[in-house]
Amino acid sequence: AVNGTSQFTCFYNSRANISCVWSQDGALQDTSCQVHAWPDRRRWNQTCELLPVSQASWACNLILGAPDSQKLTTVDIVTLRVLCREGVRWRVMAIQDFKPFENLRLMAPISLQVVHVETHRCNISWEISQASHYFERHLEFEARTLSPGHTWEEAPLLTLKQKQEWICLETLTPDTQYEFQVRVKPLQGEFTTWSPWSQPLAFRTKPAALGKDT
């Protein structure tokens, strides 16, 4: 279980969850491993069991408290270890001093809704979920619209460089079905990454008005 290439990556959702992924080529699927969290200035220790998500990849969530509680700050350091059972003992496979606000990945935006739709444009709003108040307005968003006959990968990215929880999509085709997604990222943190994409919101533009006979 030791010889394969291994990777240990964790992200903090900015509130009360640290999600970790451990991958190792050549490791046995039934290997028992866990993540142990040891903070430098908190009274708690936490452990989560790594569960298989693919052939050589395991994941778990360190749940630190109620979803919207602020369990860590910018000054916290949490030492994270991957421990795997080898016979009767646990072996440290990976270790890092984790700075939560250097390793952020927020929850996907929620509550997407169509505010107003016309023939060529559509106004959509959303909300961010479980995001720390520390960010104030220091967030950015990316959005994409799925057009008929295209894939999500082909959809151009629209960037919102500020905390703007709405968008007005323009130059749309009348009477056409679209889907829309958005994701969020704090500006803070060297290893911070984009949230997952939101659940797609389906909408249809209004038909063009029929021309009147003269």
Epitope: S6, T79, M93, A94, I95, Q96, D97, K99, E102
Partner: nanobody, 126 residues
Framework: QVQLVESGGGLVQPGGSLGLSCAAS????????MSWVRQAPGKGLEWVAS????????DYADSVKGRFTVSRDNAKNTLYLQMNSLKPEDTAVYYC???????????????????RGQGTQVTVSS
């Protein structure tokens, strides 16, 4: 760009002590695990010790365990190696090395190093 500059090497008698320093620049020092490696004359690179970003985790090669201590001062962007009870077989060029992330993998300590310094010579001889 990343720069790692070692200092503190020299000639020391067996049983003596020496302290090495590594001044780091060009990256956020505390965000990365660091290590010391060495190369004896005519030999390959050998891992000596590793330390996590805030020094809460350390690990040593069996050959130096109990004699060497790795530490860091993130305010000064400096990595240290205190070497006690030195032996002739500790003679080598000592390099400070940066890992490519905050994570260090004890079973494979050579993995993930992306930069190392020019080295400082340590000679243990009577």
């Amino acid at each position: 760009q990343v720069q790692l500059v070692e200092s503190g090497g020299g000639l020391v008698q067996p049983g003596g002590s020496l302290g090495l320093s590594c001044a780091a620049s060009g990256f956020t020092f505390s965000n990365y695990a660091m290590s010391w490696v060495r190369q004896a004359p005519g030999k390959g690179l050998e891992w000596v010790a590793s330390i996590t970003g805030f020094g809460r985790g350390t690990d040593y090669a069996d050959s130096v365990k109990g004699r060497f201590t790795v530490s860091r001062d993130n305010a000064k962007n400096t990595l240290y190696l205190q070497m006690n009870s030195l032996k002739p077989e500790d003679t080598a060029v000592y390099y400070c090395a940066k890992y490519s992330s905050s994570t260090y993998y004890p079973p494979t300590p050579a993995r993930g190093r992306d930069y190392r310094g020019q080295g400082t010579q340590v000679t243990v001889s009577s």
